[in-house]
Interface confidence: medium
């Protein structure tokens, strides 16, 4: 329970915290478990203890082993163990699993990748970030304090992210790198069979001959980003563009997101100078996504003008 795995790369700084916690006023003694040899506190040593922290500046492969920390208070002693492994630097790009910190998940709304263990070090911004060994470039990536923010997260953003920073100790600089995997999840997104909110099925819309009329096709498709979601109009089962009546045109409305967060679309059909023959047509509002297609049919009827002379 009071043992902690720590790892690092040779020639980089590694700082390890004692797994047993205590007040800052408590003294902490560190030992190399194999030999029970005390770790010095003098900072001139490459490996030295500094309270709850054990510092390797820089680390060497030979430093690998189990270190014991004893937190001493006036009334009790608490013992913890730090299992330290220092690895040789890899010549290729791949970061082996044993060097990876915990995987983090992100989504379109939350895409922070924290740099592991950075709070143990004396570092100054900015952090450098790499994905699969390539330096991150572009406005989508923002190094902010101790974490990376990715704008407009996509599934391709999944991968291994490495943060690199400089630890400063008494004027000397030491490099530190840490890598963790990032996975992308769809945050509560889902897709539904299209639901047409307007018009109602087999609706009759009253129009005035000679006037303009607008029909709105409105449908919702689910939450989150939708693949191939569309609303459109057909006339007598034919595409508007193929029907060949320039007075009747569809004009794309705005994407809408209602208060419940559903992804919805509008499409307005504009009929200029309504004519008698327009009353004979079948107007179909179609809503489509990968689940399928739904159609609501509208017909026009003549709106009788109010007789002001009666």
């Amino acid at each position: 329970k009071f043992s902690k795995q720590s790892w690092g790369l040779e020639n980089e700084a590694l700082i390890v915290r004692c797994p047993r916690q205590g007040k800052p006023s408590y003294t902490v003694d560190w030992y190399y478990s194999q030999t029970n040899k005390s770790i010095p506190t003098q900072e001139r040593n490459r490996v030295f203890a500094s309270g709850q922290l054990l510092k390797f500046l820089p680390a060497a492969v030979a430093d690998s082993g189990i270190y014991t920390c004893i937190v001493r208070s006036p009334t009790f002693n608490r013992t913890g163990y730090a299992n330290v492994t220092i690895y040789k630097k890899q010549s290729d790009c791949n970061v082996p699993d044993y060097l990876m910190y915990s995987t983090v998940s992100g989504s379109e709304k939350n895409s922070k990748i924290y740099c592991p263990t950075i709070d143990l070090y004396n570092w100054t911004a900015p952090l450098e970030w790499f994905k699969n060994c390539q330096a991150l470039q572009g406005s989508r990536y923002r190094a902010h304090k101790s974490f990376l923010v990715i704008d407009n997260v996509m599934t391709e953003d999944a991968g291994d992210y490495t943060c690199k920073f400089i630890h400063n100790e008494n004027g000397a600089n030491y490099s530190v790198t840490a890598t963790r995997s990032f996975t992308v999840k769809d945050e509560q997104g889902f897709s539904l069979f299209p639901v047409i909110g307007a018009p109602a099925q087999n609706e009759i819309k009253e129009v005035e001959i000679g006037k303009n009329a607008n029909l709105t096709c409105s449908a919702c498709f689910g939450k989150g980003t939708q693949f191939l979601a569309a609303v459109l109009w057909q006339l007598n089962g034919t595409k508007i563009t193929d029907f060949g009546e320039p007075r009747i045109q569809q004009e794309e409305g705005q994407n809408q997101s209602f208060s419940n967060g559903l992804a919805c679309l509008d499409m307005v059909l504009r009929i200029a100078d309504v004519k008698e023959e327009d009353l004979l047509l079948q107007y179909d509002c179609l809503a489509l996504n990968l689940h399928g297609l739904r159609r609501h049919t509208v017909r026009l009827s003549r709106k009788n003008p109010i007789d002001h002379h009666s």
């Epitope: 069979f193 191939l228 569309a230 459109l232 089962g237 034919t238 794309e252 489509l288 399928g292 297609l293």
Partner: nanobody, 121 residues
Framework: EVQLVESGGGLVQPGGSLRLSCAAS????????MGWFRQAPGKEREAVAG???????SYADSVKGRFTISADNSKNTAYLQMNSLKPEDTAVYYC???????????????WGQGTLVTVSS
């Protein structure tokens, strides 16, 4: 019903390009949308790209910026231009179309027979 015939598949090296074509015939007057789907061995069929009769397009995240879907209405043909191909793009690519029936579930789309795309060095 719409009949669909795909062409343009083949073997290509990583980083290479291919252009798939999908010719539609039959009840194309009511065509609402056409799409490209793919199925890799041992995996489920997944959507790749789609185009609606109004011209709006959609892409799967994995192909955004690399693949482009377009349509030539005069030829009743949809195209999928695939650039910067990767080994993981290897799959049978299917063209699908949906017409304007009252209610059409995804399984009722009209499908082509598929064309094999292999990305390998």
């Amino acid at each position: 019903e719409v009949q669909l015939v795909e062409s343009g598949g083949g073997l290509v090296q990583p980083g290479g390009s291919l252009r798939l074509s999908c010719a539609a015939s039959g009840s194309i007057y009511s065509l609402v949308a056409m799409g490209w789907f793919r199925q890799a061995p041992g995996k489920e069929r997944e959507a790749v790209a789609g185009i609606v009769s109004g011209g709006s397009t959609s892409y799967a995240d994995s192909v955004k910026g690399r693949f482009t879907i377009s349509a030539d209405n005069s030829k009743n043909t949809a195209y999928l231009q695939m650039n910067s191909l990767k080994p993981e793009d290897t799959a049978v690519y299917y063209c699908a179309a949906v017409g304007g029936a009252t209610t059409v579930t995804a399984s009722e789309w009209d499908w082509g027979q598929g064309t094999l795309v292999t990305v390998s060095s």
